[in-house]
């Protein structure tokens, strides 16, 4: 929607555009309007871009008006949220960015018979992108000055310069995404794909044998198992076997049988032969031991000379017996071969919670810090380690110690600074804790140990010109007498700034007002009205450009008044035989200086930009992807970092290219599967996945790698009549009309006779960007004056 908000109005005299007063007559003394003020309301008309604005023609983008929102002068800048001064024009089409705006201030007559009267009108042509920011515009000429602000905002869920890109955040089976500031979908954590409806499975989940419906999950296909579905399920009952595919049982080395449960190398697996016996595999799960001399039995476990092999460990002595041998162990050892260390910590001899460590034929106590000695029975002197930090002394106690702290310190080791800040500091001052003390840090404007004193900023008498000083916290305020302003009353108010006087009048500042000294042709408080000299003085035609009238303002007693036949853009030059020529201002030409010179003749707009002719100036409307005064700068489409997953961005014209890494694909390197998604090709283009790249087939009116560049085809052949300029707008176009023409294709002749230019009942004849007055009997001149 297009929004316009009236901010302020300044109509000092309460006058209308035609010089009359809004309500009643003028005071004969000071020429000011008497009686009531204007009842001011505003009308707005929004239409297609026009380089020379015409008042007539349809408001093709919408129109609206406010109720009466004030009198002669008012300021609504502070009244936020007041909708009376706001006009909202909704639009259901793509916003074309360029526009023409007509704003008119009107006086309501509050009367069914009397029509409303126009106070002032403003027009503005330009380009505006959708934004939450307001753009402030001013109307600073004529009888009234007013200020207003405009903005274009997209409806909810619509984005882009044309408000025609739709993105609605969602979190359901269709997708799980938010929308960024450009209306692109940004997937929620755990989701991927152009629609963000594909869950990102657990990292490592087999893409072949696992899948997921929810992020972080990994569901295995039949026959597969494991955290990542990458392990096949072997045949049920398979013992020493593996699988490469589900339900196999491929035997490990030295195993056989259908379930790999038969040991083909019993000797290697179990090593059953003892005492250096040699093992031979004789069949699945079968073996035979060949024993060395002195040993026998199926596993060579029987020793015929038992002590020969030194079976007693840890210096134990061996005795042969009828059953084999017997060991006599050295102190601290036990067991049939003296290999078990006797636990000397059972029972535990360590006192006061000491930990017992078993040694060979002995023990050692690891004591807690407060105890010492072989069995932790002696009290340790903790003061030897100097544990007290900020203390007068350290006293050793049984199983403890005591620190006598210095003032301001506490804690077992006197290492904690006592917090002396207990809310003594006033007026939001902060307190800094010191050792055995504190300091208040005062906020600006306060002093004293506890910040209890308000500093008197008025003590130095800072206010000038009789201003009264008011002391406040950390500041002062000057209340100024009439005629003075500024923070110190140092400024004499200058009612002449900005200059209210028009038409070159001199402004004089008074104590509480201003006075305009008007040149002879003008009158009114601001010298804004042309005097009707013919009311008072007869005048004489001098030549085809000049009339003379009696005047006491010139030494000769005569003053010369120039014709306005050359309009606002030229000066009249008299020629012989009652003829004249016009000297045109810069930017204008033609008999009456009515033609605006085409400043676009030299084609200054580059890179397919469209040139819009102004007055002695031009403006370039750039093709998509270009910006700058001459459309010379390629917009950096990489500025938003569109390439994901480490892709490198290369800027193109109104486009970008992502050089993807590590197997990522697609326009923005967001997909593992496909080069294409519905965002790859713009403006209805069809995307084709060509393996390493994508290709867009564009519909009519579009071209470029992603159908992002509008073809000029919508402007070929030129649909704009009467010299209008065609601006491509997607698959459509906008015409910027030459002066004198209006309408969507510049086919309607502007009514140059509006508002009535012919005086004294003269009849107006409308031409192409010109008019002619046919005067009533007794009147002459280009406007019958």
């Amino acid at each position: 929607q297009f929004e316009l908000e009236i901010l302020s109005m300044q109509n000092v005299n309460g006058e209308l555009q035609n010089g009359n007063c809004c309500g009643g007559a003028r005071n004969p003394g000071d020429r000011k309007c008497t009686r009531d003020e204007c009842d001011t309301y505003f009308k707005v008309c929004l239409k297609e871009y026009q380089s020379r604005v015409t008042a007539g023609g349809p408001c093709s983008f919408g129109s609206g008006s406010t109720p009466v929102i004030g009198g002669n002068t008012f300021n609504l800048k502070a009244s936020r949220g007041n909708d009376r001064n706001r006009i909202v024009l909704p639009f259901s089409f793509a916003w074309p960015r360029s526009y023409t705006l007509l704003v008119e201030a009107w006086d309501s007559s509050n009367d069914t018979v009397q029509p409303d009267s126009i106070i002032e009108k403003a027009s503005h042509s330009g380009m505006i992108n959708p934004s939450r920011q307001w753009q402030t515009l001013k109307q600073n000429t004529g009888v009234a000055h007013f200020e207003y602000q405009i903005r274009v905002t997209c409806d909810d869920y619509y984005y882009g310069f044309g408000c025609n890109k739709f993105c609605r955040p969602r979190d359901d089976f269709f997708g799980h995404y938010a929308c960024d500031q450009n209306g692109n979908k940004t997937c929620m954590e755990g989701w991927m794909g152009p629609e963000c409806n594909r869950a990102i499975c657990r990292q490592g989940c087999s893409p072949k044998h696992g899948s997921c419906k929810l992020p972080g999950d990994c569901r295995c296909q039949y026959g597969w198992q494991g955290l990542y579905c990458d392990k096949c399920i072997p045949h049920p009952g398979c013992v020493h076997g593996i699988c490469n595919e589900p339900w196999q049982c491929l035997c490990e080395t030295n195993w056989g049988g259908q379930l790999c449960d038969k040991d083909l190398n019993y000797c290697g697996t179990h090593q059953p032969c003892l005492n250096g016996g040699t093992c031979s595999n004789t069949g699945p799960d079968k073996y035979q031991c060949s024993c060395p001399e002195g040993y026998s039995g199926p596993n060579c476990e029987i020793a015929e000379h038992a002590c020969l092999s030194d079976p007693c460990h840890n210096r134990g002595s061996c005795k042969e017996t009828s059953l084999g041998f017997e060991c006599e162990c050295s102190p601290g050892w036990t067991g049939p071969t003296c290999s078990t260390n006797i636990d000397d910590c059972s029972p535990n001899n360590c006192s006061h919670g000491g930990t017992c460590q078993d040694l060979v034929n002995g023990f050692k106590c690891v004591c807690p810090p407060q105890w010492t000695g072989k069995t932790c029975q002696l009290d340790a002197n903790e003061c030897e380690a100097k544990p007290c930090v900020n203390a007068k002394s350290c006293k050793n106690l049984i199983a403890s110690y005591y620190c006598d702290c210095l003032p301001g310190w506490m804690g077992q080791n006197c290492d904690i600074n006592i917090n002396d800040c207990l809310g003594q500091c006033q007026n939001d001052a902060s307190c800094r804790d010191l050792v055995n003390g504190y300091r208040c840090i005062c906020p600006p404007g306060y002093a004293g140990d506890h910040c209890e004193r308000d500093i008197d900023e008025c003590a130095s008498n800072p206010c000038l010109n009789g201003g009264h000083c008011q002391n406040e916290i950390n500041r002062f305020q000057c209340l100024c007498p009439t005629g003075f302003s500024g923070n110190l009353c140092q400024l004499d108010i200058d009612y002449c700034e900005p200059n209210p006087c028009q038409n070159g009048a001199q402004c004089y500042n008074r104590a509480s007002d201003y006075f305009c000294k008007c040149p002879e042709d003008y009158e009114g408080k601001n010298c804004s009205h042309l005097k009707d000299h013919c009311r008072t003085t007869p005048c004489e035609v001098i030549d085809s450009c000049t009339v003379a009238m009696a005047s006491n303002d010139t030494p000769e007693g005569v003053r010369y008044i120039s014709s306005n036949v050359c309009g606002p853009h030229g000066k009249c030059k008299s020629q012989s035989g009652g003829k004249f020529t016009c000297d045109c201002n810069k930017g204008f030409t033609g008999t009456y200086c009515h033609e605006n010179i085409n400043d676009c003749e030299s084609n200054p707009c580059r890179n397919g930009g469209t040139c819009i002719d102004g007055v002695n100036s031009y403006k370039c409307i750039c093709s998509d992807g270009w910006e700058g005064a001459y459309c010379e700068t390629n917009i950096n489409d990489c500025s938003q970092n569109p390439c994901h997953n480490g892709g490198t961005c290369r800027d193109l014209v109104n486009d970008f290219y992502c050089d993807c890494k590590n197997g990522w694909k697609g326009k923005t390197c967001h997909s593992r599967d496909s080069q294409c998604d519905e965002a790859t090709c713009n403006n209805g283009g069809t995307c084709y996945d060509e393996g390493d790249a994508f290709k867009c087939m564009c519909p009519g009116g579009w071209e470029g790698t992603t159908c992002n560049i509008a073809r000029n085809s919508s402007c070929l052949p030129n649909p704009c009549h009467n010299g209008g300029t065609c601006v491509v707008n997607g698959e459509s176009f906008t015409c910027v009309c030459k002066e004198g023409w209006e309408g969507p294709i510049c086919a309607q002749n502007t009514n140059d006779c509006s508002p009535h230019p012919c005086y004294n009942s003269g009849t107006c004849v409308d031409g192409d960007n010109w008019y002619r007055c046919e005067c009533a009997p007794g009147f002459a001149g280009p406007d019958c004056r």
Partner: antibody, heavy 116, light 106 residues
Framework: EVQLLESGGGLVQPGGSLRLSCAAS????????MSWVRQAPGKGLEWVSS????????LYADSVKGRFTISRDNSKNTLYLQMNSLRAEDTAVYYC?????????WGQGTLVTVSS | DIQMTQSPSSLSASVGDRVTITCRAS??????LNWYQQKPGKAPKLLIY??SLQSGVPSRFSGSGSGTDFTLTIGSLQPEDFATYYC?????????FGQGTKVEIK
């Protein structure tokens, strides 16, 4: 007030075709996904199909895939379900539903009977 | 496909009773679960989506749960609450409903 009005149901022979319509009002139709859900006589609810706001994304239950086509006309605020190769097991009341994070509004339903 | 199982399939209760219906998903569905109420001859009506109460639904209805186990609770049963209740997962297609729980007058 959100309103959904289904039409186009009726009796059709097995193998025949039918086109259901759902006229929507009371909300911005083009901004919401839409769905069809059916309920066989005396049975529970079964999801049939859904379509995204602008129409490119369409989703179907396996039981109707290849036979049913969901579509929408945002300019007419209307949702459609084209049903071909109808079977006896397609007999049900068909509801259209506005779809955000759930089927938040339902029409009153239209009965489709497939019988020889 | 994600299977949704409701229990009990029917229950009898009196006005003022506190009623609890459970719904179990065959795999985790996070909090993507909706509850509907359907009266004979009428279209279903959304009660709760992802544990949030749909506007206009009385506060005696509440939903809880996450992952695979979910509960619909009616704090104090009213005469207009006698109906069939369905749960539905909304995370993955095909979208699936529970078989329904019929709440009857004791």
């Amino acid at each position: 007030e959100v309103q959904l009005l289904e039409s186009g149901g009726g009796l059709v022979q097995p193998g025949g075709s039918l086109r259901l319509s759902c006229a929507a009002s009371g909300f911005t139709f083009s901004s919401y996904a839409m769905s069809w859900v059916r309920q066989a006589p005396g049975k529970g609810l079964e999801w049939v199909s859904s379509i995204e706001t602008q129409g490119p994304t369409t989703l179907y239950a396996d039981s109707v895939k290849g036979r049913f086509t969901i579509s929408r006309d945002n300019s007419k605020n209307t949702l459609y379900l084209q049903m071909n190769s109808l079977r006896a097991e397609d007999t049900a009341v068909y509801y259209c539903a506005k779809t955000s994070s759930a089927f938040d509004y339902w029409g009153q339903g239209t009965l489709v009977t497939v019988s020889s | 496909d994600i299977q949704m199982t409701q229990s009990p399939s029917s229950l009898s209760a009196s006005v003022g009773d506190r009623v609890t219906i459970t719904c179990r998903a065959s795999q985790s569905i996070s909090s993507y679960l909706n509850w509907y109420q359907q009266k004979p001859g009428k279209a279903p009506k959304l009660l709760i989506y992802a544990s949030s109460l749909q506007s206009g639904v009385p506060s005696r209805f509440s939903g809880s749960g996450s992952g695979t186990d979910f509960t619909l609770t009616i704090g104090s049963l009213q005469p207009e609450d006698f109906a069939t209740y369905y749960c539905q997962q909304n995370v993955a297609t095909p979208l699936t409903f529970g078989q329904g729980t019929k709440v009857e007058i004791k």
